[in-house]
């Protein structure tokens, strides 16, 4: 019975951007100004989000979709739907409760947000440091130290490792 009733429900015919108006014999009425319905069959329209103060309008509200906000320059969005604004820092810094602080030696941040991360440890991959790291940039790893020995070409790829027990041909 419930299933039959839902199939015959006149409200299910109301498209997005409208609501099923109980006060008008369940006629589909357009959403009033500053409201929207993003799906069909709605009995009410939702109030549009207002991007006020430091929240700027990135996308205007329409009858079928909510407004989208972003943050005034100097801050960036955080949280679902930009529910918060968090301050930017410069590259080479990270945000702490004391404000923006320079990355410690051995760490870097190449963005205006996020935390300082340790430089890549080239030696873990058997490589050498080609370009030193800074607060803003990671190190650049180059060929392994063995590849840089006299007579070796730095552009020649390393020879594939031989399996144990196999002698050179």
């Amino acid at each position: 019975f419930e299933r039959t009733r839902s199939l015959q429900d006149p409200c299910s015919n109301c498209p997005a951007g409208t609501f099923c108006d109980n006060n008008r014999n369940q006629i589909c009425s357009p959403c009033p100004p500053n409201s929207f319905s993003s799906a069909g069959g709605q009995r009410t329209c939702d109030i549009c989000r207002q991007c006020k103060g430091v929240f700027r309008t990135r996308k205007e509200c329409s009858s079928t979709s909510n407004a989208e906000c972003d943050c005034t320059p100097g801050f960036h969005c955080l949280g679902a739907g930009c529910s918060m604004c968090e301050q930017d820092c410069k590259q080479g810094q990270e945000l702490t409760k004391k404000g923006c602080k320079d990355c410690c030696f051995g760490t870097f941040n190449d963005q205006k947000r996020g935390i300082c991360r340790p430089w890549t440890n080239c030696s873990l991959d058997g490589k050498s440091v080609l370009v030193n790291g800074t607060k803003e940039r990671d190190v650049v790893c180059g060929p392994s130290p063995a590849d840089l020995s006299p007579g070796a070409s730095s552009v020649t790829p390393p020879a594939p490792a031989r399996e144990p027990g196999h002698s050179p041909q």
Partner: nanobody, 123 residues
Framework: EVQLVESGGGLVQPGGSLRLSCAAS????????MNWVRQAPGKGLEWVAN????????YYVDSVKGRFTISRDNAKNSLYLQMNSLRAEDTAVYYC????????????????WGQGTTVTVSS
């Protein structure tokens, strides 16, 4: 309704003082870090100072250290910014902003903002 309302802005001469206030309502004020953030004409937002829930920690941007003092009165649901030795470069709209639920743990997002109060430092 969660709300922050700033007051106390105005025109002041260089070297003068002002005290900004922020009245909070609609939430448990004593459970949140609070911030002052400013926006100079034609510039982006700049964080100025923050204060822990119980007032035990306070931090400032370098440019205002020794001149500005942030404080709070949890019994009155109020945040303050005492501004001394004001300079022309302090001219800005000053916003009171609430730290989000994860402020100081996972991030430093601010989720509730006032409408701002204007401070103009000019002779």
């Amino acid at each position: 309704e969660v709300q922050l309302v700033e007051s106390g802005g105005g025109l002041v001469q260089p070297g003068g003082s002002l005290r900004l206030s922020c009245a909070a309502s609609g939430f448990t004020f004593s459970s949140y870090w609070m911030n002052w953030v400013r926006q100079a004409p034609g510039k982006g937002l700049e964080w100025v100072a923050n204060i822990k829930e119980d007032g035990s920690e306070k931090y400032y941007v370098d440019s205002v250290k020794g001149r500005f003092t942030i404080s709070r009165d949890n019994a009155k649901n109020s945040l303050y910014l005492q501004m001394n030795s004001l300079r022309a470069e302090d001219t800005a709209v000053y916003y009171c902003a609430r730290g989000g639920d994860s402020y100081g743990y996972r991030d430093y997002g601010m989720d509730v903002w006032g409408q701002g109060t204007t401070v103009t430092v000019s002779s």
